[in-house]
Amino acid sequence: SEVEYRAEVGQNAYLPCFYTPAAPGNLVPVCWGKGACPVFECGNVVLRTDERDVNYWTSRYWLNGDFRKGDVSLTIENVTLADSGIYCCRIQIPGIMNDEKFNLKLVIKPAKVTPAPTLQRDFTAAFPRMLTTRGHGPAETQTLGSLPDINLTQISTLANELRDSRLANDLRDSGATIRIG
């Protein structure tokens, strides 16, 4: 069954999806849609990339990671309860029936008046890769932790770690990216 992600009303929601390009810049088309992945396409498309760039997007939906390195995780800005539901990430790998498709369930909770959570000390142990946050200036990149490569078979593991995405939301609000490659 699909992996579940949570966010609060008014926050940014983060839905992870990754692939490993065959070579740097050798991208494959990816689409994100609202609703479960159909047999060939992506449902009601909210964002689409081609071999070069993001070529279609709708307001509030964007890729905050480096999609040129295979991070096609979706950020949904300022979510409302209506954003709850299933989302489809489809990696349209060329060839016969090579598509990778992932159904992710987004659960939006009413906003709570609680202090923002802080980064936990064991965060780097859970994520093998490089994680950065970016401030508002070009020189404000801070390495939070170093962590092996993520491939398609490891997506679910990463997804499970991010399941309760309060932390992910805080990172995304400050421009966090999980870098691939």
């Epitope: 494959v28 088309p29 689409c31 849609g33 159909p38 060939f40 396409e41 598509d99 159904n103």
Partner: antibody
């Protein structure tokens, strides 16, 4: 107005090859999955190939390795290359547009082109 | 592969009468609460025409006398009052899994 026009059908000997074309107009071709569906004389419908908007390819076992579907978004066209043709491939071949956002069912069809495989 | 079995193979109906066509799938075509089953109409010498998608949604431009129902493995196309232009062959089709498959068809003929 959405239009799909097939061409390239004809008589071919067993073991031969044929390339069918489907010229599309009236919609943003690149956003849609396209399929080929065939109908043998007096028989039912059989799906034979699909290509997604992103270029992923899908075939049933009956034609896998013999048929190749492709698309040229710049020319608003879809193609079906048919090799190692058999008598049982004789049929009217329809080009069909997959429903936007899904692709697995067909909201527009061409009028079909007849392929006859016979010696 | 998902096998679709349509019944009856031929249905003889008088104009103005109700026609009920059946399609049974060899396995469920339910997917996240949606039944991935379609119905098409085909007249001699013409291409098929989409009538119903996702089991019960009537395609734009299709007369209201056509309706679809069912879930899981059992589906029905109903024509509430047959008109002369409705005499044709009707096919069901699943979009749950590759390969996409069609039923063998039901021919609706004038009684």
């Amino acid at each position: 107005e959405v239009q799909l026009v097939e061409s390239g059908g004809g008589l071919v000997q067993p073991g031969g090859s044929l390339r069918l074309s489907c010229a599309a107009s009236g919609f943003t071709f690149s956003r849609y999955a396209m399929s080929w569906v065939r109908q043998a004389p007096g028989k039912g419908l059989e799906w034979v190939a699909a290509i997604s908007s992103g270029g992923s390819l899908y075939y049933p076992d009956s034609v896998k390795g013999r048929f190749t579907i492709s698309r040229d978004n710049a020319k608003n066209s879809c193609y079906l290359q048919m090799n190692s043709l058999r008598a049982e491939d004789t049929a009217v071949y329809y080009c069909a547009r997959g429903r936007e956002a899904d692709g697995g069912y067909f909201d527009y069809w061409g009028q079909g082109t007849l392929v006859t495989v016979s010696s | 592969d998902i096998v679709l079995t349509q019944s009856p193979a031929t249905l003889s109906v008088s104009p103005g009468e109700r026609a009920t066509l059946s399609c049974r799938a060899s396995e469920s075509v339910e997917y996240y609460g949606t039944s991935l089953m379609q119905w098409y109409q085909q007249k001699p010498g013409q291409a098929p025409r989409l009538l119903i998608y996702a089991a019960s949604n009537v395609e734009s431009g299709v007369p209201a006398r056509f309706s679809g129902s069912g879930s899981g493995t059992d589906f029905t196309l109903t024509i509430s009052s047959l008109q002369s232009e409705d005499f044709a062959v009707y096919y069901c089709q699943q979009s749950m899994k590759v390969p996409l498959t069609f039923g063998g068809g039901t021919k609706v003929e004038i009684k």
